[in-house]
């Protein structure tokens, strides 16, 4: 490929790094649906944005392929639990891509945050963060879900969320 | 812009891309001051360090507008706990910006982690991590808060820190 | 240096940028030795990549100097605890330098999961993620260390892992 | 300025149960810890327990399990403790104690309740 | 539990002199640098009073010539110089394990 070449694609990617793909989805009222499927999130409101990324029913889609490190936060808490002290919260990333049927994990967190209220009416509060660098093709989706999604708990925004960015 | 306007820029951004905005600040004995403002850190020594980003008074200052990951670990720990098992921790990272009078949240977490004393031995550790992208301006300073802060344990740097990153 | 030389450079940079160093490395069967060593790592199977950096017993090494943001997450769990309810378990990024014969601390967590499980019989699951950014020289390597490694949990990958993108 | 005032001195048979409190004044009543500590005649002091205001969570000492119990009226800034089935290993002078702002000591302490058990 | 042992039991200072009380426990009281020993006075008719906490901080007014030293098991109250109304039973306290235990005492009496 020739200087002109080499040129334009010098100009093409000064371009695309202006824009080198980002997004921070913020929890909201509607996050929880309880019907099993993943976690929805805010686009646009306050601190939520996307930059070279889209959104699709609670999915985070890559349009340009590459390492993405991606990450999520979901704020836990409850007055006592629903299963007691047994009761296990696991977090996860998951894609979904058109080359497979099923979900695949990605980043996964299990926490037993109710062994810290020992009787039925112990407030508590926990927290859980994932983060890791995985590779997206355009086309392929991130999304979040959380198995008990009843101990999630919502606000503002700031407390649970669900983010990429290219590295 | 002519071929001579994009050599430049591309001049420019190459000389940027080197310093791409980095920080990442260290605990340390003078960290807690109990006085309610944020927290204060290291900024130098050790595994200190600023690259295009100022520090003042327990804020990282943004030079450069852009989206940058923040984040933040707390070291939590003690024997036992001021309010039992009723105490909540809350850590969170803040901006603080001219066009606004108050700080406002970006990033927050709450625990219970005096759950974790539960036996006559009544020393506990725990760890908070926050991090997520966000859009800043230049001159907008990021803080980190923990309240309680008399139960945030800081020994070397490496258990306690906050940082950022463009993207 | 002339336009020739800033030519070069710019393609260079351009080369350099698409191959931006970055791995994630994910928990196996062999990661725990329980020889008091590192815990080591899948680096091709699955999630797992090495993109301008390289491994060995467990560390990534550097092959380009650089600012990085290193992570590592584990998971905790078991059904009671080694030492009974005062059980601290730390997690830890660790630097080796040919110009240092010790480890140097670059990232902890203690944490003390035991709490959740108030008998000795108690079923309980915790989960520690650490990141941050550290400078590290061509040469230099990173591990992770966890004590007790004993309550450190693997099944797939997605639990435990371990990774570094440059900043 | 804070203020831990003790109920007056109490004299009780051997199998009753008596209960003494402590109102305290001067600070916010539900940010520190109670403390109970029991002192014998010629002897040491010996910790019974803890009661945490804000929730009325409490910790026993185990040689004080089923002897004492702690309970909370945060509409008075009140502890009570009730010691029952007293015997003559029980008459003392118990006195409440404060948690320190770091939790970990006794700060302000009441002016102790005399207990006497006489048949 | 853990036991706390003050030596001496009592103990006869004269008038501006340097009284010095040991505590020894039976385990460490070390966390994370900090050692949970606190030191208390009593006198006949009173309550006790917190004089030191975790191990060397001298507690809101408290005179300076009252200092504790010491970490892990080994904990001193030094007193200097002494004066008339020092003269009390002082007491060792350690809370990093449940149950709080306190030292048997140690009666200064002032020459």
């Known amino acids: 490929d020739g200087p002109a070449g080499s040129w334009e694609q010098l100009i093409q990617e000064r371009r695309s790094h202006e824009v080198n793909p980002a997004a921070h989805l913020t929890g909201a009222n509607s996050s929880l649906t309880g019907s099993g499927g993943p976690l929805l999130w805010e686009t646009q409101l306050g601190l939520a944005f996307l930059r070279g990324l889209s959104y699709h029913d609670g999915a985070l889609v890559v349009t340009k392929a590459g390492y993405y490190y991606i990450y999520s936060k979901v704020q836990l808490g409850g007055v006592g639990c629903p299963l007691g002290l047994a009761s296990t919260i696991t977090h996860g990333l998951y894609k979904r891509t058109p080359r497979y049927p099923e979900e695949l994990e990605l980043l996964v967190s299990q926490q037993s945050p109710c062994g810290r209220a020992t009787s039925s009416s112990r407030v508590w509060w926990d927290s859980s963060f994932l983060g890791g660098v995985v590779h997206l093709e355009a086309g392929e989706e991130v999304v979040v879900r959380v198995l008990d999604e009843r101990l999630v708990r919502l606000r503002d925004g700031t407390r649970s969320y669900f983010g990429a960015f290219m590295v | 812009d002519g071929p001579a306007g994009s050599w430049e820029q591309l001049i420019q951004e190459r000389r940027s891309h080197e310093v791409n905005p980095a920080a990442h600040l260290t605990g340390a004995n003078s960290s807690l001051t109990g006085s309610g403002g944020p927290l204060l850190w290291e900024t130098q020594l050790g595994l200190a360090f600023l690259r295009g980003l100022s520090y003042h008074d327990g804020a990282l200052v943004v030079t450069k507008a852009g989206y940058y990951y923040i984040y933040s670990k707390v070291q939590l720990g003690g024997v036992g706990c001021p309010l039992g098992l009723a105490s909540t921790i809350t850590h969170g990272l803040y901006k603080r910006t001219p066009r606004y009078p108050e700080e406002l949240e970006l990033l927050v977490s709450q625990q219970s982690p005096c759950g974790r004393a539960t036996s006559s031995s009544r020393v506990w550790w725990d760890s908070s991590f926050l991090g997520g992208v966000v859009h800043l301006e230049a001159g907008e300073e990021v803080v980190v808060r923990v309240l309680d802060e008399r139960l945030v344990r800081l020994r070397d740097g490496t258990r306690s820190y906050f940082g950022a990153f463009m993207v | 240096d002339g336009p020739a030389g800033s030519w070069e450079q710019l393609i260079q940079e351009r080369r350099s940028h698409e191959v931006n160093p970055a791995a994630h490395l994910t928990g196996a069967n062999s990661s725990l030795t329980g020889s008091g060593g590192p815990l080591l790592w899948e680096t091709q199977l699955g999630l797992a990549f090495l993109r301008g950096l390289s491994y060995h017993d467990g560390a990534l090494v550097v092959t380009k100097a650089g600012y990085y943001y290193i992570y590592s997450k584990v998971q905790l769990g078991g059904v009671g605890c080694p030492l009974g309810l005062a059980s601290t378990i730390t997690h830890g990024l660790y630097k080796r330098t040919p110009r240092y014969p010790e480890e140097l601390e670059l990232l902890v967590s203690q944490q003390s999961p035991c709490g959740r499980a108030t008998s000795s019989s108690r079923v309980w699951w915790d989960s520690s993620f650490l990141g941050g950014v550290v400078h590290l020289e061509a040469g230099e390597e990173v591990v992770v260390r966890v004590l007790d490694e004993r309550l450190v949990r693997l099944r797939d990958g997605t639990r435990s892992y371990f990774g570094a993108f440059m900043v | 300025q804070v203020q831990l005032q003790q109920s007056g001195a109490e004299m009780a048979s051997p199998g009753a149960s008596v209960t003494l409190s402590c109102k305290a004044s001067?600070?916010?009543?539900?940010?520190?810890?109670m403390n109970w500590v029991k002192k014998r005649p010629g002897q040491g002091l010996e910790w019974i327990g803890r009661i945490y205001p804000v929730s009325g969570e409490t910790n026993y000492n185990q040689k004080f399990m089923g002897k004492a119990t702690f309970s909370v009226d945060r509409s008075s800034s009140t502890v009570y403790m009730v010691l029952n089935s007293l015997t003559s290993e029980d008459p003392a002078v118990y006195y409440c104690g404060r948690g320190s702002y770091y939790w970990n000591a006794m700060d302000y302490w009441g002016q102790g309740t005399t207990l006497t058990v006489s048949s | 539990d853990i036991v706390m042992t003050q030596s001496p039991a009592s103990l006869a200072v004269s008038l501006g002199q340097r009284a010095t009380i040991s505590c020894k426990a039976s385990q460490s009281v070390d966390f994370d640098g900090d050692s949970y020993m606190n030191w208390y006075q009593q006198k006949p008719g009173q309550p006790p009073k917190l004089l030191i906490y975790?191990?060397?901080n001298l507690e809101s007014g408290i005179p300076a010539r009252f200092s504790g030293s010491g970490s892990g098991t080994d904990f001193t109250l030094n007193i200097h110089p002494v004066e008339e109304e020092d003269a009390a039973t002082y007491y060792c306290?350690?809370?990093?394990?449940?149950?709080?235990?306190f030292g048997g005492g140690t009666k200064l009496e002032i020459k």
């Open positions: 001067g600070y916010t009543f539900i940010d520190h810890i």
């Open positions: 306290q350690q809370s990093i394990e449940d149950p709080w235990t």
């Open positions: 975790s191990a060397s």
